[in-house]
């Protein structure tokens, strides 16, 4: 058993049919010695008396808020949560496996630049009685500070018969140098509590590996005289690290017909303009990627040819 | 990444082309190592990230762009005088360049070159003949060092009398390639910045 926060405790349980329970001794936080009784949750029934209560925690029916009282007055609370371990593996019932980029990916993180700011998100089908708390650091043995905000519900989607909820959190490394070469990864730890179930999820990454620039901005077409060609121009996204001559991007320009089956023409360039042939009803899209370190491409920025 | 990239004009900052070749070569070599050594811990997640130049050179700090000198987190061990020698700087105003930048890059290349050559000598003794260093990568390191044109003492190649542990050597190769790729990215950024100045 360990303390998650004040008056909230996590009991770690091996979860198999003939597993023994965990013996837990609860102590009432009071100088009083006599006349103390214990109750659980909303029930007014007395579970035991005395300054300590020894319980066997085996089921979610044994978890909950234990309260000690004296003469009708509440003295203290202890909320017990359960953390299940099945076949030596901690349970992952609360979050959905996003399976990208690999199986058992519960947390996904992205950064728009090298400033040390990043966003992580996760998915669940649970809609109520759910809380998250996020901690992060650079390295684990001698951790350096990363500050994370509160996790918030960022999207709701219908997936077949189920509703899916996306939560996200923004974190900022306390003293980040955009030009630094990372040797210690960022560690992100998410505590998830659903009703009386506790689970924790972790992700470890280098900012350089989770970079995904915003799409190029101000995408414009300039027709070239007496030609089907157009000059496409764009700019670096505002959120990209500066100076741009140091943090350079490379671009992919794509001409896509109305039909998905039509052949796509693609050009790669380090410049912020390109000359392409604009077909009728086609659209021109541009996306960006770090020029020197191949992490993710940005989403496409698009304009119609017409 | 096999993308069409224009060859730089001869008038360009001379080292940019070499640094781009370096990054391409080390990335290809790392990819080859990851594929060949698929049963070894050779991915970014599996290896320990060691920097053989740590405490010996200060490339990141010395080559910091002017715009980032206002960022206190970037100013750990920065020098502030400016570089004046080295042929890469020919006909370029280099007021943004901090002391030791290009010489620091040169020292990095020299250290990695020695490590890679020593390692290659060991790998050539491996009866499995599983992996060797790409000669192209070693040649590109050499070319960039020549372009930087710093006069520096030659470092003798390390020689070892004991029988090499090939498993450890291959893991060390992965660690070295990952670190060198990261340094090659920094070098490319610096050269690109220099070129634009």
């Amino acid at each position: 058993i360990w303390e998650l926060k004040k008056d909230v405790y996590v009991v770690e349980l091996d979860w198999y049919p003939d597993a023994p329970g965990e013996m837990v001794v609860l102590t009432c936080d009071t100088p009083e010695e006599d006349g103390i009784t214990w109750t659980l949750d909303q029930s007014s029934e007395v579970l035991g008396s005395g300054k300590t209560l020894t319980i066997q925690v085996k089921e979610f029916g044994d978890a909950g808020q234990y309260t000690c009282h004296k003469g009708g007055e509440v003295l203290s609370h202890s909320l017990l949560l359960l953390h299940k371990k099945e076949d030596g593996i901690w349970s992952t019932d609360i979050l959905k496996d996003q399976k990208e980029p690999k199986n058992k990916t519960f947390l996904r993180c992205e950064a728009k630049n090298y400033s040390g700011r990043f966003t992580c998100w996760w998915l669940t089908t649970i809609s109520t009685d759910l809380t998250f708390s996020v901690k992060s650091s650079r390295g684990s043995s001698d951790p350096q500070g990363v500050t994370c905000g509160a996790a918030t519900l960022s999207a709701e989607r219908v997936r077949g018969d189920n509703k899916e909820y996306e939560y996200s959190v923004e974190c900022q490394e306390d003293s980040a140098c955009p030009a630094a070469e990372e040797s210690l990864p960022i560690e992100v730890m998410v505590d998830a509590v659903h009703k009386l179930k506790y689970e924790n999820y972790t992700s470890s990454f280098f900012i350089r590996d989770i970079i995904k620039p915003d799409p190029p901005k101000n995408l414009q077409l300039k027709p070239l005289k007496n030609s089907r060609q157009v000059e496409v121009s764009w700019e670096y996204p505002d959120t990209w690290s500066t100076p741009h001559s140091y943090f350079s991007l490379t671009f992919c320009v794509q001409v896509q017909g109305k039909s998905k089956r039509e052949k796509k023409d693609r050009v790669f360039t380090d410049k912020t303009s390109a000359t392409v042939i604009c077909r009728k009803n086609a659209s021109i899209s541009v996306r960006a990627q770090d020029r020197y370190y191949s992490s993710s491409w940005s989403e496409w920025a698009s304009v119609p040819c017409s | 990444r096999n993308l069409p990239v224009a060859t730089p004009d001869p008038g360009m900052f001379p080292c940019l082309h070499h640094s781009q070749n370096l990054l391409r070569a080390v990335s290809n070599m790392l990819q080859k190592a990851r594929q060949t050594l698929e049963f070894y811990p050779c991915t970014s997640e599996e290896i320990d990230h060691e920097d053989i130049t740590k405490d010996k050179t200060s490339t990141v700090e010395a080559c910091l762009p002017l715009e980032l000198t206002k960022n206190e987190s970037c100013l750990n061990s920065r020098e502030t005088s400016f570089i004046t020698n080295g042929s890469c700087l020919a006909s370029r105003k280099t007021s943004f360049m901090m002391a030791l930048c290009l010489s620091s890059i040169y020292e990095d290349l020299k250290m990695y070159q020695v490590e890679f050559k020593t390692m290659n000598a060991k790998l050539l003794m491996d009866p499995k003949r599983q992996i060797f260093l790409d000669q192209n990568m070693l040649a590109v390191i050499d070319e960039l060092m020549q372009a930087l044109n710093f006069n520096s003492e030659t470092v003798p190649q390390k020689s070892s009398l004991e029988e090499p542990d090939f498993y450890k050597t291959k893991i060390k190769l992965c660690i070295l390639l990952h670190a060198f790729r990261i340094r090659a990215v920094t070098i490319d950024r610096v050269m690109s910045y220099l070129n634009a100045s």
Epitope: P20, G21, L40, Q42, S43, G48, T54, Q56, G61, D62 | -
Partner: antibody
Framework: EVQLVQSGAEVKKPGESLKISCQSS????????IGWVRQMPGQGLEWIGI????????RYNPMFRGQVTMSVDKSSSTAYLQWSSLKASDTAMYYC????????????WGQGTMVTVSS | DIQMTQSPSSLSASVGDRVTITCKAS??????LAWYQQKPGKAPKSLIY???SRQSGVPSRFSGSGSGTDFTLTISSLQPEDFATYYC?????????FGQGTKLEIK
């Protein structure tokens, strides 16, 4: 006052289905799991299993798994034990009981439902 | 499954007698043991839990002791209403199991 009131005695033929009930009152139904115990004529007590009234989480005795089904209706504070195809060997007294949290034993018992299966 | 063995299977005693019933577990169950009393035609009633804690409302003449594998239920001075069958139950490891019962009769 804590009370567990069980449905009346049943006489059934082999192969028939049956669902017996246990209605709870006098306490917070969702705080306490409900269990079932079998007592064959002239025999001792056998633990069938327990169930959470909150989310229908169930622990069956392997000996009874597949033979009986436990269920619960939170809105009426009622637990159920059912058979899809009765056998003569299911003839017994069935007790529902309230599981004590933080312990696991049964602190309050229903009066029992006698199930007789005979052709 | 854990086997619970009670002894004796039955015993005769008189009002005012001190009676001891024992229960042996086939493996260590800590203190997670309960005792129940059942009268003919009635549901069992909880007497003792955690090997030695009395259920509220149970007279003080009933006491439990033991831990691990050996447990006892003691009735210090038999009363006429105590003649019944007594069961022990371990609730440490699933499936929870009962002893075969000890029938206490009037001598």
């Amino acid at each position: 006052e804590v009370q567990l009131v069980q449905s009346g005695a049943e006489v059934k033929k082999p192969g028939e289905s049956l669902k017996i009930s246990c209605q709870s009152s006098g306490y917070s139904f969702t705080t306490y799991w409900i269990g079932w115990v079998r007592q064959m004529p002239g025999q001792g007590l056998e633990w069938i299993g327990i169930m959470s009234p909150v989310d229908s989480d169930i622990r069956y005795n392997p000996m009874f798994r597949g033979q009986v089904t436990m269920s619960v209706d939170k809105s009426s504070s009622t637990a159920y034990l059912q058979w899809s195809s009765l056998k003569a060997s299911d003839t017994a007294m069935y007790y529902c009981a309230r599981r004590r949290p933080g312990q696991g034993y049964f602190d309050f018992w229903g009066q029992g439902t006698m199930v007789t299966v005979s052709s | 499954d854990i086997q619970m063995t009670q002894s004796p299977s039955s015993l005769s005693a008189s009002v005012g007698d001190r009676v001891t019933i024992t229960c042996k577990a086939s493996q260590n169950v800590g203190s997670w043991l309960a005792w129940y009393q059942q009268k003919p035609g009635k549901a069992p009633k909880s007497l003792i839990y955690s090997a030695s804690s009395r259920q509220s409302g149970v007279p003080s003449r009933f006491s439990g002791s033991g831990s691990g594998t050996d447990f006892t239920l003691t009735i210090s001075s038999l009363q006429p209403e105590d003649f019944a069958t007594y069961y022990c139950q371990q609730y440490d490891i699933y499936p929870f199991t009962f002893g075969q019962g000890t029938k206490l009769e009037i001598k």
